[in-house]
């Protein structure tokens, strides 16, 4: 789990499909600070 101040964690039910792929729920990438703007 990401516990730095720059991480936005998303513990949302159904995020992973049964196949292990990511469901396209338009959630925000977890590590905001590693991305420029």
């Amino acid at each position: 789990a990401c516990d730095t101040a720059t991480c936005v964690t998303h513990r949302l039910a159904g995020l992973l499909s049964r196949s292990g792929g990511v469901v396209k729920n338009n959630f925000v990438p977890t590590n905001v600070g590693s991305k420029a703007f």
Partner: antibody, heavy 115, light 108 residues
Framework: EVQLQQSGPELVKPGASVKMSCKAS????????MHWVKQKPGQGLEWIGY????????KYNEKFKGKATLTSDKSSSTAYMELSSLTSEDSAVYYC????????WGQGTTLTVSS | EIVLTQSPTTMAASPGEKITITCSAS???????LHWYQQKPGFSPKVLIY???NLASGVPARFSGSGSGTSYSLTIGTMEAEDVATYYC?????????FGSGTKLEIK
């Protein structure tokens, strides 16, 4: 084409509040955070904070807590920043910027605080 | 907060010259959190380099970035007139995110 369209220039009196907008288009609004950055005339860049439009979560620079309030409206793909108790120190250009390495910034909103 | 100190503050270079701008952080940061921006007079900033060494889309290959820990640099391989601008480093390792104070690049 991704675009961030910011609201027009504001001239307000000391002590008042102002709410500026940043309308996003060309991408899924809830898929990226929206940052806000301050630039005083002839000076450098200062990060105010960001909002996650997916869940309205916010992170602020401590310096701007109580000064800036970030909100968003998913239905119109618009991010807002309200600045309160304005003083001359708040006179600046304020930018919104999409998080995500692709470098999309609004054109800036010029705020002038003067009596 | 993490303070980013840029050097030099201002500089003038001739066309074709190689330019290096440095960014020193007050605390060590991972390179994935260090980004560079260019701002031309009267325009919004734009990202040049993200995660210390990755060239942003549409940025000419004469720009490059490197570094680790507390020391990072932006290099322009051959200065061109269109590179006249102010350059900022920025860290996303710790909130508040912070920018360097800027390096103003002029042409001789």
């Amino acid at each position: 084409e991704v675009q961030l369209q910011q609201s027009g220039p504001e001239l307000v009196k000391p002590g008042a509040s102002v709410k500026m907008s940043c309308k996003a288009s060309g991408y899924t609004f809830t898929s990226s955070v929206m940052h806000w950055v301050k630039q005083k005339p002839g000076q450098g860049l200062e990060w105010i904070g960001y909002i996650n439009p997916y869940n309205d979560g916010t992170k602020y620079n401590e310096k701007f807590k109580g000064k800036a309030t970030l909100t968003s409206d998913k239905s119109s793909s618009t991010a807002y920043m309200e600045l309160s108790s304005l003083t001359s120190e708040d006179s600046a250009v304020y930018y919104c910027a999409k998080g995500g390495n692709d470098g999309y910034w609004g054109q800036g909103t010029t705020l002038t605080v003067s009596s | 907060e993490i303070v980013l100190t840029q050097s030099p503050t201002t500089m003038a270079a001739s066309p074709g010259e190689k330019i290096t701008i440095t960014c020193s952080a007050s605390s060590s940061i991972s390179s994935i959190y260090l980004h560079w921006y260019q701002q031309k007079p009267g325009f919004s900033p734009k990202v040049l380099i993200y995660r210390a060494s990755n060239l942003a889309s549409g940025v000419p290959a004469r720009f490059s970035g490197s570094g680790s820990g507390t020391s990072y640099s932006l290099t322009i391989g051959t200065m061109e007139a269109e590179d006249v601008a102010t350059y900022y480093c920025q860290q996303g390792s710790t909130i508040p995110f912070t920018f360097g104070s800027g390096t103003k690049l002029e042409i001789k």
